[in-house]
């Protein structure tokens, strides 16, 4: 029998969907096991004009020690403000730096993407190393990307049309998931259904979905019914925040007593058995029916509470508009360059307009200082010696000062440019965790405590220890103590910072072998950051200690020998 | 000057597996992609797939996954081409050839006949 | 994938004469990033290895003479021999490598 119910979308105030899938509209996973480089890559295809993105790297430790290092090649066709979270990965980011702009300093190692097509940045990727994923993605708010996680069966990546990247790969899309409901003919009462439909994805091992259900009403007001369709591999973790009546295929549990599994039943699977479920169990709404592809959680928001179902005829907005500036987040994006005793400040237009802001003037903190209207772009130059610099040992400062229509009074920013020249950075060694007593020896089978600072310090910036490594000659070889901003190895730690925000970590040495090296070299890349502001002023330096080794002792723990 | 030279003529049954050798010199051998091609009698052209001797980087045609095994043995600049559980219509001429970035397939090997018949 | 479809497949013709060959793709091999078609022109003879004429659809490869040239965008393209030559006889492939790599199915180009 058909179910008179003619789905309709549904206006984003009164529904809406939000998921994370691991499917992808092309795709690959590979084993790559004994490679020294995990090679990812990432198409990432967006509608015009500036979007953002979150992009997330996890790793997990293996073998209680940090993955082999990672090269992330991220290939945009357009504008894209990337914040970006990879803390400890020993990561190289390949990308178009005039469509990637960074929310904040990203802190790795970064490369040019020569201006390819696919085929072409796939084998410019796989140069470098075995691919271990790839993925296409339209239009991504957030992704994920697990390390260390591929389960291909191929030793080969090929981009292969609707992809499952199991673990390796989840991204949330932009534009929420279309959300459709109708009025059941013939049914009496307030009773609402909301009917979930995962289908089937390219990979048919368990799932676990979860779906989280937020219904704005008060409790008592609500008769509701959960339908959750998909296929037999998958079982359900559900979140409400409020009681309702569960219908769903395969196994279900609830998040505060996950581990009782409660059997569901068989659904049929398709729109309009799902409605005649839906009828079946007296609801007189469709509050939501979605059809989504195989996600890990989904997130369904509604504001229905049984009352009268309002659908939208016209295409629907999907994201709110935005029609005020965001002064913050307008003057996150001036880029301050320092080069040849001059500060230059430089602002995108794209990106204010994508802002909705309207530039009135942009000054130094002398207001005769004002910025060029480059076409593009606007452009603020002054040599260290006027418009208004304040010149310290350490730095150079200013402020920017950017007037906007929406604002009476002016945005300001402060802007630093670093003082090179001034700059010392040196290594510490020391014996005992107290960092009183600086040494140059080190004996294998005690603990060295390394520190380095920078003098004079400089407040506005941090001062991060990006590597170091040991030189032990011909016959030691070379010993990687840190490697991306972390310990490798049982026998490195972090430490806290000094005081002062100095880096710190201890390390232990032991030696296999005979001879034991008399001399050693420590050698530590740092890179001073600026706490606020772009990635143009970060300053790399290696600091390099003649170390003695004294001692022989044969137990233990790392080295090369 | 550069040169591909490839190995000889080959008879295979159905079923078998053809390896099929090319030797490079006058270059970098790890420096660029090499590709094999081939060419049924009186056909045109197919690609096969491709190798970085570089890295040992892998890409195949849909039509070859699993059944091509594309290696090098840089120690002697020589890429290898295998293929697997082969059928009468395998039977074509096997070309290595070198690809440049810029202008594309820029040097070809001389070309191994492999006929599978039983 | 994209496919590429060559006309004609057999062409007779004489020596000195203006011959155009044309390759026709599926979808656009114009990368908009760069402006360039990723499409190139190969000659081979009986019994040999192609030889690479043309690539980005119209730039010469060193030693192939003028009278060789390419020309088209997005998903029309030609071959040009402005005057033929005894040594010409062959056929000729288009190829694309923007997406993967295809060939064309080859215009055999014969004596009159």
């Known amino acids: 029998e058909t179910v008179h119910c003619d789905l309709q979308p549904v206006g984003p105030e009164r529904g809406e969907v939000t998921y994370t899938t691991s499917q992808v509209s092309k795709g690959c996973v590979a084993q790559a096991p004994n490679a020294i480089l995990e090679v990812h890559v990432l198409f990432l295809e967006f509608p015009t004009g500036p979007s953002q993105l979150e992009l997330t790297l996890q790793a997990s430790k293996q073998n209680g020690t940090w993955p082999r290092e990672v090269l992330l090649v991220l290939s945009v066709n357009s504008s894209v403000f990337l914040h970006l979270q990879a803390l400890g990965i020993p990561l190289h980011l390949a990308y178009n730096s005039s469509l990637v702009t960074f929310q904040e300093p990203p802190g790795v190692n970064t490369t040019e993407l020569p201006s390819f097509p696919k085929t072409q940045i796939l084998e410019w990727a796989a140069e470098r190393g075995p691919i271990t994923s790839a993925a296409e993605l339209n239009d991504p708010q957030s992704i994920l990307l697990r390390l260390g996680q591929a389960q291909g069966s191929l030793s080969f990546c090929m981009l292969e049309a609707s992809q499952d990247m199991g673990r390796t790969l989840e991204w949330r899309p932009r534009t929420p998931a279309l959300v459709r409901g109708c009025h059941l003919e013939g049914v009496a009462g307030h009773k609402e259904a909301h009917i979930l439909r995962v289908l089937p994805g390219h990979s048919a091992g368990p799932r676990t979905v979860t779906v989280k259900v937020e219904l704005s009403c008060a409790p008592g007001d609500l008769d509701a019914v959960l339908i959750l369709q998909g296929p037999p591999y998958v079982s359900w973790l559900i979140d409400a925040n409020h009681n309702m009546q569960i219908w769903t295929t395969g196994e279900y549990s609830f998040k505060i007593f996950p581990e009782k599994n409660i059997r569901g039943f068989k659904l049929p699977d398709t729109p309009q058995g799902l409605l005649g479920e839906a009828r079946m169990l007296n609801a007189s709404i469709v509050a939501s029916f979605v059809e989504l592809p195989l996600a890990s959680i989904v997130s369904l928001h509604a504001s229905s509470c049984g009352g009268r179902l309002q659908t939208s005829p016209a295409p629907i907005q999907t994201t709110p508009p935005k029609d005020t500036c965001s002064p913050e987040l307008l003057m996150s994006l001036i880029q301050t360059k320092c080069a040849d005793d001059a500060m230059t400040l430089v602002l995108k237009k794209e990106l204010v307009a994508h802002l909705k802001c309207t530039i009135t003037g942009l000054t130094f903190w002398d207001p005769s200082c004002e910025a060029e209207d480059r076409g593009d772009k606007f452009v603020l130059r002054s040599a260290y010696s006027s418009c208004g610099m304040q010149v310290s040992a350490s730095m150079i400062s200013n402020e920017a000062v950017v007037n906007i229509l929406s604002s009476s009074s002016p945005q300001r920013k402060k802007v630093h440019c670093l003082n090179m020249d001034s700059l010392s950075f040196q290594l510490g060694l020391y014996l005992s965790p107290h960092f009183l007593q600086a040494s140059n020896t080190i004996e294998p089978g005690q603990q060295s405590f390394v520190q380095v600072r920078v003098s004079p310090s400089v407040s506005e910036f941090l001062l991060q220890l990006d590597s170091c490594h040991l030189d032990l000659g011909p016959e030691g070889g070379t010993v990687e103590l840190i490697q991306g901003r972390a310990a490798k190895g049982n026998c490195v730690s972090l430490l806290s910072p000094s005081p002062e925000g100095d880096p710190r970590f201890s390390f232990l040495l032991h030696f296999y072998t005979v001879p034991i090296p008399k001399t050693g070299t420590l050698s530590c890349t740092v890179a001073l950051r600026p706490k606020t502001g772009s990635q143009d002023q970060e300053v790399h330096r290696t600091v390099f200690m003649r170390l003695n080794i004294i001692s022989p002792d044969l137990s233990g723990c790392t080295s090369k020998g | 000057q550069v040169q591909l030279v490839q190995s000889g003529a080959e008879v295979k049954k159905p079923g078998a597996s053809v390896k099929v050798s090319c030797k490079a010199s006058g270059y970098t051998f790890t420096s660029y992609w090499m590709h094999w091609v081939r060419q049924a009698p009186g056909q045109g052209l197919e690609w096969i797939g491709n190798i970085y001797p570089g890295s040992g980087s892998t890409f195949y045609d849909e039509k070859f996954k699993g059944r091509a095994t594309l290696t090098v043995d840089t120690s002697i600049s020589t890429a290898y081409m295998e293929l697997s559980r082969l059928r009468s219509d395998d039977t074509a001429v096997y070309y290595c050839?070198?690809?440049?970035?810029?202008?594309?397939?820029?040097?070809w090997g001389q070309g191994t006949t492999v006929t599978v018949s039983s | 994938d994209i496919q590429l479809t060559q006309s004609p497949s057999f062409l007779s013709a004489s020596v000195g004469d203006r011959v155009t060959i044309t390759c026709k793709s599926s979808?656009?091999?114009?990368?908009?990033?760069?402006?360039?078609?990723?499409l190139a022109w190969y000659q081979q003879k009986p019994g040999k290895a192609p030889k690479l004429l043309i690539y980005?659809?119209?730039t010469r490869e060193s030693g192939v003479p003028s009278r060789f040239s390419g020309s088209g965008s997005g998903t029309e393209f030609t071959l040009t021999i402005s005057s033929l030559q005894p040594e010409d006889f062959a056929t000729y492939y288009c190829h694309q490598y923007l997406s993967s790599y295809t060939f064309g199915q080859g215009t055999k180009l014969e004596i009159k």
């Open positions: 050839t070198r690809r440049n970035y810029v202008t594309g397939f820029d040097y």
């Open positions: 980005w659809a119209s």
């Open positions: 979808q656009s091999v114009l990368y908009s990033s760069n402006q360039k078609n990723y």
